[in-house]
Amino acid sequence: VPRWRQQWSGPGTTKRFPETVLARCVKYTEIHPEMRHVDCQSVWDAFKGAFISKHPCNITEEDYQPLMKLGTQTVPCNKILLWSRIKDLAHQFTQVQRDMFTLEDTLLGYLADDLTWCGEFNTSKINYQSCPDWRKDCSNNPVSVFWKTVSRRFAEAACDVVHVMLNGSRSKIFDKNSTFGSVEVHNLQPEKVQTLEAWVIHGGREDSRDLCQDPTIKELESIISKRNIQFSCKNIYRPDKFLQCVKNPEDSSCTSEI
């Protein structure tokens, strides 16, 4: 008789999760010489230790600290790109602008990107059937707490001018409930960060509105200003051209507004 197991509302652990994490770790450490010292088996052990045998609605930041310790990485603090609801373009950008980094360009972000995982209380099993959904089940689930933890540390490390890419096609361009709005904004350190510069990415070809005047952007400006950090905003009207000009800045068409 199969043992009863908790049914959660979200998808289960990504298939071959342990193998995927281990393989990504090995690949990352091969590509990034500064992380060659990392012992990927130890990283996986610490990752596993954060959620295995624990109730998947009772995970804390403390549980992930051993993994944070092993994955400690120094990225240039003035080259950080945050993003909200526009991950693909942000990643395309840092793939071209190699001296800038999103969270997913760091080891820990790279390991977990697009993966789901959870365990079960008091068993060493990984739950491949279902995992808690943030809204329908609980917020203190393994995936949400992981991203909250790494995002907080990433934002805390930032300095000078920090950039954030925002999706101008969404009803809330700045969403207080996103990871950027609820975690990263509040963990930028005013004594280190001079300016937050928002890049609002337009979706429509003919969209010439100044989305920097959007009420949610004004709300972001207010939050940031109250934290004694300067705020600036730029419209990126043509994201395709924007990427092209990052690749080829000397192109004659790149002098005009993008």
């Epitope: 010292h37 012992d39 088996q41 130890s42 052990d45 610490a46 230790g49 930041e61 403390e62 600290q65 051993p66 944070m68 310790k69 092993l70 400690t72 933890t149 907080r152």
Partner: antibody, heavy 119, light 107 residues
Framework: EVQLLESGGDLVQPGGSLRLSCGAS????????MSWVRQAPGKGLEWVAD????????WYADSVKGRFTISRDNSENTLYLQMNSLRAEDTAVYYC????????????WGQGTTVTVSS | QSVLTQAPSASGTPGQRVTISCSGS??????VSWYQQLPGTAPKLLIY???ERPSGVPDRFSASKSGTSASLAISGLQSGDEADYYC??????????FGGGTKLTVL
Amino acid sequence: EVQLLESGGDLVQPGGSLRLSCGASGFTFSDHYMSWVRQAPGKGLEWVADISARGSNTWYADSVKGRFTISRDNSENTLYLQMNSLRAEDTAVYYCAKNWNYNYGMDVWGQGTTVTVSS
Amino acid sequence: QSVLTQAPSASGTPGQRVTISCSGSSIQNNYVSWYQQLPGTAPKLLIYRNFERPSGVPDRFSASKSGTSASLAISGLQSGDEADYYCASWDDSLNWVFGGGTKLTVL
């Protein structure tokens, strides 16, 4: 019985070296992070160094970085602390301790070994 | 200079309840553990993972954590509880750090 037993403490001159050992028994040594913690006479506890279960990662307090080296031999169930360029302020009782599940706490402690740095 | 702050001393009479506190910013996101060091002996783990007791530790010892502070409570104080008590956690660099210690005197 779970046990840690330190040895190697001695009187040594400033600038000298010393190697402390800590033998472990009663638990699977190779599964656990281990730490060295010291206590100067009449003072509180001070964390010195950590080593991961497989020995591939080490961490040090700023006060000993570059002078002390933590290592382990899992086949011999032994933890080491190599202490070089010793200073008077390194005088202390040195304890080895087993870490419970990385960061839960230090659940097993040795009895300590005394290091005195003096001319 | 420890990033975990403890009062240097505390006292109580037999049977009383005493509380020892520990504060520091790193407590917020890291587990806190508590240690008892009887005179002339090695430290002993009293509390791990913020509030859990290892087997063998009497339930007179309890602990809690809230925000950037943690506390250890000892109820039904006994003369044998006279000792130094240390809190510990990981710091912002994810290395162990101990509080300065609190000397508990049973009057």
